[in-house]
Amino acid sequence: TLNSVLNSNAIKNLPPPLGGAAGHPGSAVSAAPGILYPGGNKYQTIDNYQPYPCAEDEECGTDEYCASPTRGGDAGVQICLACRKRRKRCMRHAMCCPGNYCKNGICVSSDQNHFRGEIEETITESFGNDHSTLDGYSRRTTLSSKMYHTKGQEGSVCLRSSDCASGLCCARHFWSKICKPVLKEGQVCTKHRRKGSHGLEIFQRCYCGEGLSCRIQKDHHQASNSSRLHTCQRH
């Protein structure tokens, strides 16, 4: 099973399996017990943005970067911040939104071919370690990808959420990435509470839809920390 494969590949600090797979939002629990791992809820829209503590950019969503929320603020307190759009000031590539990169302190479009080689080097470097970032959602791996003309429907493979049709996000499924539905009110979501708690997100959930946030279900407040159920709720 995947569980035994994980153990035998010596991956440390994985969370215990949950009671259900995080594959298809709001769907039935998977009948395959070997693949029950937490999904992700890292890709908050700006409308329902929730601060997520981080130590590095890779812990944030595709449209975020990791930094101190206040200029010159406490370096020890960093959260995932919304990425910077074209022509905004930046200090490194990760600060710029997908499709852009940081050049001379400004986010510019990465469509130009000359930039692709630079990105490819970053991709290749990260492949040396068999057990690098388990969550694996580094934006650097997608900047140089071709642009799509048609938006992916549910189940279509994708590189980023902008490749998917409205109401869908790009999330991990098995070892690939596909378009999945953005979560609706009442659907189970995944809330990462602390650094290093992502686990191996084989089946990643989308984020909650507009006007919703991922919060503990009211009747689950008494439950133990490990079993608290989070659902998408109105602000």
Epitope: T1, L2, V5, N9, G20, A21, A22, G23, H24, S27, A28, V29, S30, A31, A32, P33, G34, I35, I123, S126, F127, D130, H131, S132, T133, L134, D135, G136, Y137, S138, T141, T142, S145, K146, G155, S156, V157, C158, L159, R172, H173, F174, W175, S176, K177, I178, L200, F203
Partner: antibody, heavy 117, light 112 residues
Framework: QVQLVESGGGVVQPGRSLRLSCAAS????????MHWVRQAPGKGLGWVAV????????YYADSVKGRFTISRDNSKNTLYLQMNSLRAEDTAVYYC??????????WGQGTTVTVSS | DIVMTQSPLSLSVTPGQPASISCKSS???????????LYWYLQKPGQPPQLLIY???NRFSGVPDRFSGSGSGTDFTLKISRVEAEDVGVYYC?????????FGQGTKVEIK
């Protein structure tokens, strides 16, 4: 045209190394996990290893763990299998296969590895 | 690991007659996404395995409609409505809901 083409097989002595390649075309390689599957002469099919779409996660069959390394170069649309400390029981036809998440896809023709002294 | 068990292991069929192969998995192959990750492959002599059926019952492009797949959960069947000479080879079922992917032992189909 969607296809996978394996290469790099050959005859090698026990204990030596070999590197297999799988060239992918006709689909968005960097969005898919990729697998290696093998078939020993006259035997059934056996899974060898998997790598996630971005290369961050890799898993191996117990029989090859610590000896084989799966990797990929998304800029070249190529999957690799570095095989070290080869044994006679590694003799097989090696196939690369795309992760089965959306539309299914046929395997390549395979590349033959023979480990013999 | 999920164990895939095929039966029979060999089958001798008269051309034009039907044939049926069973595949049982040790765990359910139904995923929470609603899909069941069960595949059927045919390996003709001297050739790589070729995909016949994906997700239990979907025929891969170019596969004749005499091939059909059915089943759910842990029990699956591949049927050939009228066997033809070109259908000889070894048929494998495979699951991909977990790694390692696992395969049935194979069913060798030959013509009488």
């Amino acid at each position: 045209q969607v296809q996978l083409v394996e290469s790099g097989g050959g005859v090698v002595q026990p204990g030596r190394s070999l590197r297999l390649s799988c060239a992918a075309s006709g689909f968005t390689f960097s969005s898919y996990g990729m697998h290696w599957v093998r078939q020993a002469p006259g035997k059934g099919l056996g899974w060898v290893a998997v790598i996630s779409y971005d290369g961050s996660d890799k898993y191996y069959a117990d029989s090859v763990k610590g000896r084989f390394t799966i990797s990929r170069d998304n800029s070249k649309n190529t999957l690799y299998l570095q095989m070290n400390s080869l044994r006679a029981e590694d003799t097989a036809v090696y196939y690369c296969a795309r992760d089965l998440v959306d539309t299914a896809m046929p395997w390549g023709q395979g590349t033959t590895v023979t480990v013999s002294s | 690991d999920i164990v895939m068990t095929q039966s029979p292991l060999s089958l001798s069929v008269t051309p034009g007659q039907p044939a049926s192969i069973s595949c049982k998995s040790s765990q359910s192959l139904l995923h929470s996404d609603g899909k069941t990750y069960l595949y059927w492959y045919l390996q003709k002599p001297g050739q790589p395995p070729q995909l016949l059926i994906y997700e239990v019952s979907n025929r891969f492009s170019g596969v004749p409609d005499r091939f059909s797949g059915s089943g759910s959960g842990t029990d699956f069947t591949l049927k050939i409505s009228r066997v033809e000479a070109e259908d000889v080879g070894v048929y494998y079922c495979m699951q991909s809901i977990q790694v390692p992917w696992t395969f049935g032992q194979g069913t060798k189909v030959e013509i009488k």
